[in-house]
Interface confidence: low
């Protein structure tokens, strides 16, 4: 049986083709606004939109096993469509501007097409052919055309106006569109060429399907959805009346679904993603910033990326040749981003979220979620309030600072407590930073009157103040170990500056047009920073060869940046307190001569064996 | 120790807009950490939250309602207000100011105003 | 948003005996992040549990909390007379936050 679907923001209808009546609503919960829709006709599911929610969701056809299977990183996401042959869904965001692709779950996403693209909307796909044809509405409207894994891209009808509903009759190769500000409905072959106009006396043209001899439309000012014959326009007939913003409709048929491509085999024996491509060929395509394997089947994720917070979100971005767009990593429940740190041993993300005041870990693609350090009393007195991170990947440490108890706290990454390691009456230490390659800490000390820079062993002893002078409000620290430098910025101050690791040679690396640095990270031969006020994630080359560059604008609520660097697993092994903390039962430091000793916090003392720590 | 106290009229007539301040002492909105919240309670039914206002003046509405609240503070004075557009009978109710804590629950609340709205 | 269905709506119960009051999540909303009032007739609600098992301040421990996921569970050991009283559970693991329509635990 066939029959129409259609959204209307906070319903999805459904009316047999047969009888032409029977509207029925497909029972879903939850839905805000609806907007673009597609359906598998194998699984027996639809898939939708909702431009409130910025999600996409599926459903089995009665409206149970209800799924959002994209909810990160979507703006205005106007046009989808599902990759029945791939079983791949791929949508168009107008906000993003991008053109994205996924599984039919939701898993191994992938940005398409995000250069030069400007508010994408309607989106059609020949699976069978490879290609995928899409609407743009900025700028200079017009109808492109490209494979489907982004490539061999073209536009095919240059003047039109905003185009919207685009179909595919399958069966005799012809595109068909509603032009919103012509309100007309056109077609032409699948060149773009040998263009029709279908039907010229309507009032508002808006969603568009076709289904054997048939268009079918939705018109917003008649407030109804019609039909006609799709080669003359005429044999008009009204299906359904008095419905209002019917944002799209679609023909549910096996029909509209038939054809083969080797994706449709085994999913072309590719591990993450099956992608068409003309004529007849398929290429296996990886997840975002992942990198497909000299096997070209199989893929491997990145292990040199920049990670980037803002207020409610964490963003992974990778330095290629393909200038590849940064990505949303999918964790759920973030509400204030503090700070950030990674661990290249489990690949595992941590951070400070200040709403909630603690520290979270998981694994990049969200699962995992744990909580690492959390307050047990919700009084007006926080007992903590976790500030900044920093982890000692050798011991496996977290040492974070507190802007309740204004100390350096020390917990293991399962979540354990080590104990405090600094503390003082007048600390109040911020932004940490360690360095386990030679055993110590930097922190800034914003006292009163008196801000500092500070270092200290890893457990807590050895302190010496670096900078005392020069200094208003030393918010960030970043260390490259291979280059002995210690990096800072100062918001009031407005510069960021650096030194040799003892807090020799100092220099102002930039003082110019910066106005809210809040993060600072090295990467390669570059320092990143974040500008919070400009929103903005600049860098500057510190061999003075290239300068300062801008790296990425308008991002909204910035709140700090890390590099990760490929994790050497022999260099790694060959630290001493790598081996099980070095047979320490709390910290293990490295000392002059790459020996280790073992420490204890401050509430302990080291026991008599010299590796545990008991009370005094 | 922490008191909250709500103020505001008895009766609003339909259309009117409703203004509640909510009036506390023993905390401030100045600290990291804390905030303000409304909750309200029609006559023998559920809570229902309506929005919230914390120390950096984050602001969060109820989904159904936000194109009808607005919530602000005057940290000075230790005030929260509230301000309801378009009241109708169904909005009649005993309306609740709480203190929220991290992670977001209320820790202490005023008695409560109830507010007739009826021509 | 998130729906959050109390059962039963009524609990008939004698002092001494053990109650025990559901809340189920129409989605996930984790292990840390539901709270149970409780409010007697003509008072405001009172914090009984925070992140779904830890007691307020000043609650005795015969009450107690359990669950996560979607289905979570108040447990009050053995009914006091002042125990009796309308409890609603509320989710605050995604905006905007939500409560339960509420379990009323009357006196047999």
């Known amino acids: 049986e066939a029959f129409l679907l259609f959204s209307r923001r906070a319903d999805i209808r459904r009316i047999s083709l047969e009888t032409n009546n029977n509207n029925v609503a497909i029972p879903l919960t939850g839905v805000k606004e609806a907007s673009a829709l597609d359906f598998d006709v194998t699984d027996n599911r639809i898939y939708w939109t909702d431009i409130s929610l910025k999600t996409i969701s599926r459903a089995f056809m009665n409206g149970s096993a209800l799924e959002h299977v994209v909810e990160f990183g979507l703006d205005a996401p106007a046009g989808m469509a599902v990759d029945w042959l791939g079983k791949n869904l791929y949508w168009a965001d107008t906000g993003t501007n991008r053109i994205e692709v996924s599984k039919l779950d939701g898993q191994h996403r992938q940005v398409l097409v995000w250069k030069d693209l400007d508010s994408p909307r309607a989106l059609a796909l020949d699976p069978a052919e490879g290609f995928m044809y899409w609407t743009e509405w900025g700028g200079k409207p017009k109808i492109d055309r490209a494979a489907m894994d982004g490539s061999e891209r073209t536009t095919l009808v240059p003047n039109v106006g905003r185009a919207n509903g685009l179909t595919i009759d399958y069966a005799k190769r012809r595109l068909y569109w509603t032009d919103l500000d012509t309100n007309l409905i056109e077609s032409s072959n699948m060149l773009g060429l040998n263009r029709e106009v279908i039907a010229d006396d309507l009032p508002h043209p808006f969603g568009l399907t076709q289904y054997q001899d048939y268009i079918y439309w939705t018109d917003w000012s008649r407030r109804s959805i019609e039909r006609a014959n799709k080669t003359s326009g005429q044999n008009r007939t009204i299906i359904q009346g008095h419905l209002d913003y019917v944002m799209d409709i679609l023909v549910f048929h096996s029909s509209r679904q038939s054809g083969w491509n080797e994706c449709a085999s085994s999913n072309g024996h590719c591990s993450h993603l099956c992608l068409a491509v003309p004529v007849g060929g398929f290429v296996c395509g990886c997840p975002a910033h992942y990198s497909l394997n000299a096997d070209n089947r199989t893929c491997s994720a990145p292990t040199t990326f920049l990670l980037f917070s803002q207020k409610s979100a964490i963003n992974r971005m990778v330095i290629d040749e393909q200038q590849s767009p940064d990505i949303i990593l999918p964790i759920h429940s973030l509400r204030n981003v503090r700070a950030i740190d990674y661990d290249p041993l489990d690949k595992q993300l941590y951070w400070i979220d200040s709403r909630q005041n603690m520290i979270r870990k998981a694994q990049e693609d969200g699962s995992q979620g744990f909580t690492v350090v959390v307050s047990s009393v919700p009084s007006q007195n926080l007992e903590i309030q976790p500030y900044d991170l920093s982890i000692d990947i050798y011991s496996r440490y977290i040492y974070w600072t507190c802007e309740a108890t204004n100390v350096i706290n020390v917990t293991r990454l399962d979540g354990r407590s080590v104990g405090v390691v600094l503390k003082g009456e007048q600390d109040r230490p911020r932004a940490v930073v360690v360095n386990p390659e030679k055993g110590y800490m930097y922190f800034t000390n914003l006292q009163e009157r008196s801000p500092k820079i500070e270092r200290a062993a890893l457990d807590g002893t050895e302190r010496e103040v670096l900078f005392f002078s020069g200094l208003s409000k030393p918010i960030a620290l970043a260390l490259d170990s291979r280059l002995g430098k210690l990096f800072w910025a100062d918001s009031d101050l407005r510069r960021i500056e650096s030194s040799d690791l003892s807090g020799a040679n100092r220099i102002v690396l930039e003082d110019s047009n910066i106005l809210q640095p809040v993060g600072l990270t090295v990467f390669e031969n570059w320092l990143y920073w974040i500008d919070k006020q400009q929103q903005m994630i600049e860098k500057i080359d510190m061999t003075g060869r290239e300068g300062r560059t801008k790296v990425q604008a308008r991002i909204a609520q910035l709140s700090d940046i890390h590099a990760v660097k490929e994790l050497n697993l022999q260099e790694y092994r060959q630290h001493p307190c790598a081996q099980d903390n070095g047979g320490c039962s709390h910290i293990c430091l490295v000392k002059g001569d790459g020996t280790t000793r073992c420490s204890c916090p401050m509430h302990l003392v080291l026991l008599q064996d010299e590796l545990s720590c008991g009370e005094p | 120790q922490v008191q909250l106290k709500e103020s505001g009229p008895a009766l609003v007539k339909p259309t009117q807009t409703l203004t509640l301040t909510c009036t506390f002492s023993?905390?401030?909105?100045?600290?990291?950490?804390?905030?303000v919240g409304w909750i309200r309670q029609p006559p023998g039914k559920a809570l229902e939250w309506l929005a919230w206002i914390d120390w950096d003046d984050d602001k969060s509405y109820s989904t159904s309602l936000k194109t009808r609240l607005t919530i602000s503070k005057d940290t000075s004075k230790n005030q929260v207000v509230l301000t309801m557009t378009n009241m109708d009978p169904v909005d009649t109710a005993t309306y609740y100011c709480?203190?929220?804590?991290?992670?977001?629950?209320?820790?202490?609340w005023g008695q409560g105003t109830l507010v007739t709205v009826s021509s | 948003d998130i729906v959050l269905t109390q059962s039963p709506a009524t609990l008939s119960l004698s002092p001494g005996e053990r109650a025990t009051l559901s809340c189920r999540a129409s989605?996930?909303?984790?292990?840390?992040?539901l709270a149970w009032y409780q409010q007697k007739p003509g008072q405001a609600p009172r914090l009984l549990i925070y992140g779904a098992s830890n007691r307020a301040t000043g609650v005795p421990a015969r009450f107690s909390g359990s669950g996560s996921g979607t289905d979570f569970t108040l447990t009050i050991s053995s009914l006091e007379p002042e125990d009796f009283a309308t409890y609603y559970c509320?989710?605050?693991?995604?905006?905007?936050?939500?409560f339960g329509q509420g379990t009323k635990v009357e006196i047999k």
């Open positions: 023993g905390f401030s909105l100045s600290n990291r950490g804390g905030g």
């Open positions: 709480a203190r929220m804590h991290l992670p977001l629950v209320f820790d202490s």
């Open positions: 509320q989710q605050y693991y995604d905006y905007p936050q939500t």
């Open positions: 989605q996930f909303i984790g292990s840390r992040y």
